[in-house]
């Protein structure tokens, strides 16, 4: 068997660090035999059998010239096997980032720190951290490890199933090179780090016959559970076309009706996304809706002045695009008796 | 020979914005997580904001998070960092520096100066 | 995120003195403590990394100890180009930290 113990990494290949002393080890005689050493291609002896080194071939400081692939030969000439030096450093730390758009799942992703210019490998697992009794701040001992399976197309990321929301999580990502290994631990909760996707759906409609509204209305992310026990909470941002500011609300439900649009401005709106108990962070903005307000034609009936503060304006259902959800949608308010000087705006 | 140099900085109103570069030499800039520290005039030193080699991770200070970005141009050897909203409490000497790994800092550039005031 | 303190904030001390600067996490950090000197209108300079590790070209008097929350900074001969401050700064999480420094100067 061979004398030198094989790294990980391609076969043949031995591993240094630049600046260091490394030692390379011919392969094919027994540990101790007596061996010469030669660069591939060149004649002239490096290290002699007589080195009191016996299989082994020390460079002292080794820099980028000395990588390339070396040969030892036995005390009668035998090759004793071909051996390629190659350069670099030990792993750091790697970066993690961890992320979750809903309450059930996340996802870590990881990045060298430094490159070590070396094959490498990654190494992840996770732990839960259970918490030994309500008033204790004491922790038990971890639950696992288990894997986090990586993604099989090689992006650097692994996604832990089935989390559980209220626990904490000590995501271990250890990255492995010839030259030793590293490991970066992060405690994660879902909690902190939940960021739903944006909305879907975003649509942007006149209210005919109201010429400063907008109806908005949106669906649920579709990565967000279909049967939520965490609710969102919305943020609608909206603004005319070529105004650099936008008018920010946040809408009771799954659609929200802007009074104060300005009259026949397309106008831009976008929505995001958040735990209704401000767990984690906002979402992205969705992609911007346009819409434009209706022209200013009269309708039909118009009531006295003194119903438009008194009279709570009625209108149908309007059907939307989510699937019914009575605690998300409340009933929706495409005439809002909170803006009445719009309406009298129309008579004028 | 191994080194880091800063430009970018200046005065500027509060509010306004300003980008800083970084241009390094001497050593294989595409190999090392980069950061940014400064230093209030008679303060200590804060930790500002890193980036991995890839430039696909980064990482803020809450102080700055949403009005700061880093980024990297490993083609260039320059780092840079985008300061948006600035505020008087943002003026410091900003240094470059960068790794050995992620948080340790073995080579600073001399620092630029970033004043915030009306 | 983990805060850093550091005693004393300023000492004076003769040459040839040793001069000790101590330094605390608010939370385990392992071994990730690195030393950082830097003299006035000069950038920083890393003396000491990974708590007790000499960065290379730096003299041998300056040494450090410690692990878990509590760190030790020496210099066993003060010399008068170590006039500086010192300050302690940890990497073990992904947000990095200085401590508020401590001033040396001489006697």
């Known amino acids: 068997s061979s004398p030198c113990p094989q790294a990980w990494g391609p076969p043949g290949v031995q591993y240094g660090q630049p600046g260091r002393s490394v030692k390379l080890c011919c392969p094919g005689v027994t540990a101790g035999d007596p061996v010469s050493w030669f660069r591939d291609g060149e004649p002239k002896l490096l290290q002699g059998p007589d080195s009191g080194l016996g299989h082994e071939l020390v460079l002292a400081q080794a820099d980028s010239t000395d990588e390339g692939t070396y040969i030892c030969q036995t005390l009668d000439g035998a090759l004793g096997g071909t051996v390629t030096l190659q350069l670099g450093y030990p792993p750091a730390r790697p970066v993690v980032s961890c992320q979750a758009a809903d309450y059930e799942n996340f996802s870590c992703t990881w990045s060298p720190s430094q490159i070590s210019g070396l094959p490498t490998r990654y190494l992840t697992s996770y732990r839960k951290k259970t918490v030994l009794g309500a008033d204790s701040q004491r922790r038990s001992p971890s639950t696992g490890p288990w894997p986090c399976p990586q993604d099989p197309l090689g992006a650097a990321r692994c996604v832990v199933h089935g989390a559980e929301f209220w626990s904490q999580y000590r995501i271990n990502v250890t990255e492995v090179n010839p030259l030793g290994a590293s490991t970066r631990l992060l405690d994660v909760s879902l909690q902190s780090i939940l960021r739903p996707d944006p909305p879907q759906g975003l649509r942007v409609e006149s209210v005919p016959g109201y010429p400063r509204r907008l109806r908005a209305s949106w669906t649920y992310p579709a990565s967000w559970p279909c049967q939520p026990h965490f609710l969102l909470k919305f943020r609608l941002q909206y603004r005319p076309a070529q105004h650099p500011a936008w008018s920010t609300v946040e809408p009771a439900g799954l659609e929200e009706v802007i009074t104060d649009a300005v009259a026949g401005l397309p106008h831009a709106v976008r929505v995001s996304a958040r735990d209704f108990l401000d767990a984690g962070t906002w979402s992205t903005w969705s992609p911007e809706a346009w819409g434009t307000p209706s022209t200013g034609t009269i309708p039909k009936e118009i009531p006295a002045w003194g119903q438009l503060h008194t009279q709570p304006e009625v209108e149908p259902q309007v059907d939307s695009p989510a699937p019914p959800r009575p605690s998300l949608q409340p009933h929706p308010r495409l005439l809002d008796h909170r803006d009445s000087v719009e309406q009298v705006a129309v008579l004028a | 020979e191994v080194q880091l140099l800063e430009s970018g900085g200046g005065l500027v109103q509060p509010g306004g914005s300003l980008r800083l570069s970084c241009a390094a030499s001497?050593?294989?800039?595409?190999?090392?997580?980069m950061t940014w520290v400064r230093q209030a005039p008679g303060k200590g030193l804060e930790w500002v904001s890193s980036?991995?080699?890839?430039?696909?991770?980064?990482q803020y200070a809450d102080s700055v998070k949403g009005r700061f970005t880093i980024s990297r141009d490993n083609s260039k050897n320059t780092l840079y960092l985008q300061m948006n909203s600035l505020r008087a409490e943002d003026t410091a000497v900003y240094y470059c520096?960068?790794?050995?790994?992620?948080?340790?800092?073995?080579?600073w550039g001399r620092g630029t100066l970033v004043t915030v005031s009306s | 995120d983990i805060q850093m303190t550091q005693s004393p904030s300023s000492l004076s001390a003769s040459v040839g003195d040793r001069v000790t600067i101590t330094c605390q996490a608010s939370?385990?950090?392992?071994?990730?403590l690195n030393w950082y000197q830097q003299k006035p209108g000069k950038a920083p300079k890393l003396l000491i990394y990974?708590?007790?590790n000499l960065q290379t070209g730096v003299p041998s008097r300056f040494s450090g100890s410690g692990s878990g929350t509590d760190f030790t900074f020496t210099i066993s001969s003060l010399q008068p180009e170590d006039i500086a401050t010192y300050y302690c700064?940890?990497?073990?999480?992904?947000?990095?930290?200085f401590g508020p420094g401590t001033k040396v100067d001489i006697k």
């Open positions: 939370q385990d950090i392992n071994n990730y």
């Open positions: 700064q940890q990497h073990e999480s992904q947000s990095p930290t």
């Open positions: 001497g050593f294989t800039f595409s190999w090392y997580s």
């Open positions: 520096a960068k790794g050995p790994g992620w948080g340790s800092f073995d080579l």
């Open positions: 990974d708590a007790s």
């Open positions: 980036i991995v080699p890839y430039g696909d991770l980064t």
